[in-house]
């Protein structure tokens, strides 16, 4: 559940993500200054981040749980002299791959028409048991939907 040691992620607000904040119809010059943007704009950005961050956190939680178990096995094989140099790099991405594979398992289409079913399944797997029925709305959020689609359609190696 720690937020630490999360090197898989690169999820900050990129230029493309920030473009809507630069819409001249929504932001006139007096709301900006030469070095950046005001707090009202940061608030808008944070609104868009929440759903994405939550999915990222779920992935990281699963990855950390998997790595704890796998590192135990790694240690035993290391003691036996069968440890190979590429194991670490393999393990780094494995849990995330498994999570994405699990997300799309048994689903032919990638546009997620079964949001509620997915969220219920996520809820059962969530470590701290704090998922509520209100999570059923999260994948209705466009940011979350787009983010998960991106996760599925992008190779892990492309995002590292």
């Amino acid at each position: 559940r720690s937020l630490q040691d999360t090197e898989e992620k690169s999820r900050s607000f990129s230029a493309s993500q920030a473009d809507p904040l630069s819409d001249p119809d929504q932001m006139n010059e007096d709301k900006r200054h030469s070095q950046g943007t005001f707090t009202s704009d940061y608030s808008k950005y944070l609104d868009s981040r929440r759903a994405q961050d939550f999915v990222q956190w779920l992935m990281n939680t699963k990855r950390n749980r998997n790595n704890i178990a796998k590192r135990h096995d790694e240690f035993e094989r290391h003691a036996e002299g069968t440890f190979t140099s590429d194991v670490s790099s393999y393990l780094e991405g494995q849990a995330a791959k498994e999570f994405i594979a699990w997300l799309v398992k048994g689903r032919g289409r990638r546009d997620f028409p079964e949001e509620v079913a997915i969220v219920e399944e996520l809820g059962r797997r969530h470590a701290d048991g704090s998922f509520s029925d209100e999570m059923n709305t999260i994948l209705d959020n466009l940011a979350a939907r787009d983010f998960i689609n991106w996760l599925i359609q992008t190779k892990i190696t492309d995002r590292k």
């Epitope: 999360t6 690169s10 920030a18 940061y42 950005y45 944070l46 759903a51 998922f131 209100e134 999260i138």
Partner: antibody, heavy 119, light 112 residues
Framework: QVQLVESGGGVVQPGRSLRLSCVAS????????MHWVRQAPGKGLEWVAV????????FYSDSVKGRFTISRDNSKNTLSLQITGLRAEDTAVYYC????????????WGQGTLVTVSS | DIVMTQSPDSLAVSLGERATINCKSS????????????LAWYQQKPGQPPKLLFY???TRESGVPDRFSGSGSGTDFTLTISSLQAEDVAVYYC????????FGQGTKLEIK
């Protein structure tokens, strides 16, 4: 382990400028948004500014708008804060803070660098 | 901006006793889509930077002793130390991470 080391603080006269730096290690700096948070002597914490992981986007608190500029150099794992038009109320310890997975949440902080504005 | 108000400003508790710090936000920090409250707690010991204890109101950060607990929802939150230890003497801050970050004024915890 994660380390954030600030420098550049000192005593400076009102109206002058100062540049603070923060050198990061122990994590992939380029992947994380970075913040400056300040704390006036004996007072509470105040968020100052944030820069995106690529340095292209920056946000500031209203109290420092137009006077502070946040920047980063990912090739040197360095975060900076350029402060101009210093005021007495800018006197504070300035902390460099790493953002966690969750936006606007700070999981690692530097030890801070003290800026004293005095004539 | 959301205003965070902590109470009390200072607190003296005997070793081994329970310490309770409250935090109130001027508006709700509950995100209904995931039912998470975007409220964090930090501990700051003298001469040190703040240390993250909790996020999402009750999710304990790695390495934080389980005598610490966080609770609350919407606008009212509580940090509880079930059995105060000498090393818990510090100033505690709440922070909302729902929107542009703002902190409470801090609560100084001392030993009685």
């Amino acid at each position: 382990q994660v380390q954030l080391v600030e420098s550049g603080g000192g005593v400076v006269q009102p109206g002058r400028s100062l540049r603070l730096s923060c050198v990061a290690s122990g994590f992939t700096f380029r992947n994380y948004d970075m913040h400056w948070v300040r704390q006036a002597p004996g007072k509470g914490l105040e968020w100052v500014a944030v820069t995106s992981s690529d340095g292209l986007n920056k946000f500031y608190s209203d109290s420092v708008k137009g006077r502070f500029t946040i920047s980063r150099d990912n090739s040197k794992n360095t975060l900076s804060l350029q402060i101009t038009g210093l005021r007495a109320e800018d006197t504070a310890v300035y902390y460099c803070a790493k953002e966690s997975i969750l936006a606007a949440l700070f999981d690692y902080w530097g030890q801070g660098t003290l800026v004293t504005v005095s004539s | 901006d959301i205003v965070m108000t902590q109470s009390p400003d200072s607190l003296a508790v005997s070793l081994g006793e329970r310490a309770t710090i409250n935090c109130k936000s001027s508006q709700s920090v509950l995100y209904s889509s995931n039912n998470k409250n975007y409220l964090a707690w930090y501990q700051q010991k003298p001469g040190q930077p703040p240390k993250l204890l909790f996020y999402w109101a009750s999710t304990r950060e790695s390495g934080v002793p389980d005598r610490f607990s966080g609770s609350g929802s919407g606008t009212d939150f509580t940090l509880t130390i079930s059995s105060l230890q000498a090393e818990d003497v510090a100033v505690y801050y709440c922070q909302q991470h729902y929107t542009t970050p703002t902190f409470g004024q801090g609560t100084k915890l001392e030993i009685k």
